[in-house]
């Protein structure tokens, strides 16, 4: 229904808290550069003006949109263009196309630094002494570094983030606490960050049918018992709320969040069995919970797939009368039978029946066409259960560490003119899959490890549109969303690539590497790999392994050394003479 | 037993607006999916819209998005088809239908509209 004041609307349904930690979010995720002291004196302006318009919601501009009050709030701010550049042509224009503007200025990778937690101690004094503004830190820090983040998401790892520094902080060693705790927090909001922008990226360059069909095939292995018509009005909410939150509609994005949880959870009977406990939990807590619930039981008397949409004559009827709808109880009914499947490959096989149905239903006799296609999905099917069991048994072999330098080589050989950064960080991602999911149960492991690793290839995807280098990642990216990861697992080595020229400085080591966490040293040590690759793409793994070796254990010795300095000053261009010779 | 009945039909120039009701009785209303369906002269079934028991639209055919909105209030256990803009191609006889599980169970005796100048 329509409000006089939408603002006051929000304040009211999401509370000053909420609101004010999803107007920080949406600031910072526009405007990346801007200080916290800047954002929060804006975040108070817009709640201070949300608080009149609830007391009187014919007072003055009350009744403008959240876009229009926000975007005017951002141009107001001064020396815009000297930090922003380009994006403050957009304050220009008017609403919604000011809007649009400043999404595409979104920046994923800004030039930041990376977030650095301080010390224990230090950090227990800051919250102790000011939670609010400690974790107002942690959304702008959070939320400039991710600005697709999915902002009611992010009020949950901080409330996450609350919880535990209100218990770790009142330990006696608050570092043995706090570490693994926050690493864990840390790291389900890395993955977080990296599909949420997946979903961005297909509303974005596929529109919101593409997302829909995501959405059914998920919510159906969730809801197995659910009919097809509740299926397709979850996803239809889900697919709403997507678009407001990736569009920059923060505080709708929350507020539907919120209510499509009520609705959830005051119609369990007609959607899930395990939704209770997620019904007795606070609203972001409630929310998250049902985002990650557990699978139902499938029922038990599901008839053979190929009855409705194989055997029955009248399938070519069927699908012309409403094909949306007839597709969509294909992938709701083959999506309910099968937990055990990727919504990626869901969705390829979705596809792959469509392309069929086309075909056939327009040829002379329909039923001997199609009757087949349910045998055509098995290569389908096929490849990702291969690709699982080769890569979890390299992870088995190697570790995490291992595998992601084995990934590292197969990605650079496959696309050697991107840079080495990227080609690290994709390659660092891409490798924890076998930590995430190579030790689940059998069902668990294709589900988990293509969604996962479809989600870090946008992230390389979005990366490399920015500056794109290689035509191959560019043809991946280009392509349907769901055939992407097939894509880059097809890709080999590129012969077109003119091999780096050999440069010594680009494998020259100092003694502050013997200093770093361990994290950064692999970094180290990982940066130097691609840059052999890029040097040698057709090198072995044999003549790899002796070279990696070789500078591991340099490294190990020069930092044990007694002057470390001299021993990296000597033996460095050693090194270099012998990888030089190894890989020659 | 399940009726459902159709109103709102006629005569209508190009452009112009018409809106159906369906009045429905004999089922909880509350608790079905409903839909509009139609059938234009000579041609076969075309699904036109679904709205789910709480008011979410789950489904518009490609040819009347941006021009129909189906709507339903369930105090009244009516069920709504606002059609505007419509073209020549949109004449037909329009059912109101109640959806159950998979397909439509329950059909109304259809109302017509005719778009033409």
């Known amino acids: 229904e329509a409000h006089k004041s939408e603002i006051a609307h929000r304040f009211k349904d999401l509370g000053e808290q909420h609101f004010k930690g999803l107007v920080l979010i949406a600031f910072s995720q526009y405007l990346q550069k801007c200080p916290y002291e800047e954002h929060i004196k804006l975040v108070q302006e817009v709640t201070d003006f949300a608080k009149t318009c609830v007391a009187d919601e014919n007072a003055e501009n009350c009744d403008k949109s959240i876009h229009t009050l926000f975007g005017d709030k951002l141009c107001a701010i001064p020396k815009l263009r000297d930090n922003y550049g380009e994006l403050a042509d957009c304050c220009a224009k008017q609403e919604p196309e000011r809007n649009e503007c400043f999404l595409q200025h979104k920046d994923d990778n800004p030039n930041l630094p990376p977030f650095q937690r301080p010390e224990a101690e230090a950090m227990c004094t800051s919250f102790q002494e000011n939670p609010t503004s400690f974790l107002g830190h942690y959304l702008h820090e959070v939320a400039r570094r991710h600005p697709y983040f999915y902002a009611p998401e992010l009020l949950y790892y901080a409330e996450k983030y609350n919880e535990v520094l209100t218990q770790c902080c009142t330990e006696s060693d608050k570092a043995a606490c706090l570490t693994p705790k926050l690493d864990a927090v840390k790291e389900k909001a890395l993955v977080a960050a990296v599909r949420q922008r997946m979903k961005c990226s297909s509303m974005q360059r596929f529109g919101e049918r593409a997302f829909k069909a995501w959405a059914v095939a998920r919510m159906s292995q969730r809801f197995p018992n659910a009919e097809f018509a509740e299926i397709t009005k979850l996803a239809t909410d889900v697919t709403k709320i997507n678009k407001e939150c990736c569009h920059g509609d923060l505080l709708e994005c929350a507020d539907d969040r919120a209510e499509l949880a009520k609705y959830m959870c005051e119609n369990q009977a007609t959607i899930s069995s395990k939704l209770q406990a997620c019904c007795d939990k606070p609203v972001l807590q409630k929310s998250q919970c049902l985002a990650e619930i557990e699978h139902d039981n499938i029922p038990a008397d599901l008839p053979s797939i190929a009855a409705d949409f194989v055997e029955d004559k009248e399938v070519c009827k069927n699908y012309a009368e409403a094909k949306d709808v007839f597709l969509g109880t294909f992938l709701y009914e083959y999506s309910r039978r099968h937990p055990d499947y990727s919504v990626s490959l869901l969705l390829r096989l979705a596809k792959k029946y469509e392309a069929t149905l086309e075909k056939c239903c327009a040829e002379g006799d329909p039923p001997a066409c199609y009757g087949t296609v349910l045998a055509e999905f098995q290569p389908l099917v096929e490849e990702p259960k291969n690709l699982v069991k080769t890569n979890c048994e390299l992870y088995e072999k190697l570790g995490e560490y291992g595998f992601q330098n084995a990934v590292l080589v197969r990605y650079t050989q496959k696309a050697p003119q991107v840079s080495t950064p990227t080609l690290v960080e994709a390659a660092r991602n891409l490798g924890r899959v076998g930590t995430k999911c190579c030790t689940l149960p059998e069902a668990q492991r294709l589900p988990c490890v293509e969604d996962y690793l479809s989600a870090i290839l946008n992230r390389l995807c979005v990366l490399h549109e920015k500056t794109p280098v290689s035509e191959k990642v560019t043809k991946c990216c280009s392509g349907s969303l769901v055939e992407r990861r097939p894509c880059f697992s097809a890709l080999t080595v590129d012969e077109t690539y003119v091999p780096k020229e050999f440069k010594a400085e680009t494998f020259t080591f100092h003694s502050d590497i013997c200093t770093l966490p361990d994290k950064e040293k692999q970094i180290k040590k990982q940066t130097a790999l691609a840059e052999l690759v890029k040097h040698k793409p057709k090198a072995t793994e044999d003549q790899l392994k002796t070279v990696m070796g070789d500078f591991a254990q340099f490294v190990d010795k020069c930092c044990k050394a007694a002057d470390k300095d001299n021993c990296f000053a000597t033996e460095g261009p050693n090194l270099v003479a012998r990888s030089k010779e190894a890989l020659a | 037993e399940v009726q459902l009945l159709e109103s709102g039909g006629g005569l209508v120039q190009p452009g112009g607006s018409l809106r159906l009701s369906c009045a429905a009785s004999?089922?909880?209303?509350?608790?079905?999916?409903m839909g509009w369906v139609r059938q234009a002269p000579g041609k076969g079934l075309e699904w036109v819209s679904l709205?789910?028991?709480?008011?979410?639209?789950?489904y518009y055919a490609d040819s009347v998005k941006g021009r129909f909105t189906i709507s339903r209030d369930n105090s009244k256990n009516t069920l709504y088809l606002q059609m505007n803009s419509l073209r020549a191609e949109d004449t037909a006889v329009y059912y109101c239908?109640?959806?159950?599980?998979?397909?439509?169970?329950?059909w109304g005796q259809g109302t017509l509209v005719t778009v033409s100048s």
């Open positions: 239908a109640r959806w159950s599980s998979r397909a439509f169970d329950y």
């Open positions: 004999g089922f909880t209303f509350n608790h079905y999916t």
């Open positions: 709205i789910h028991p709480s008011g979410t639209v789950i």
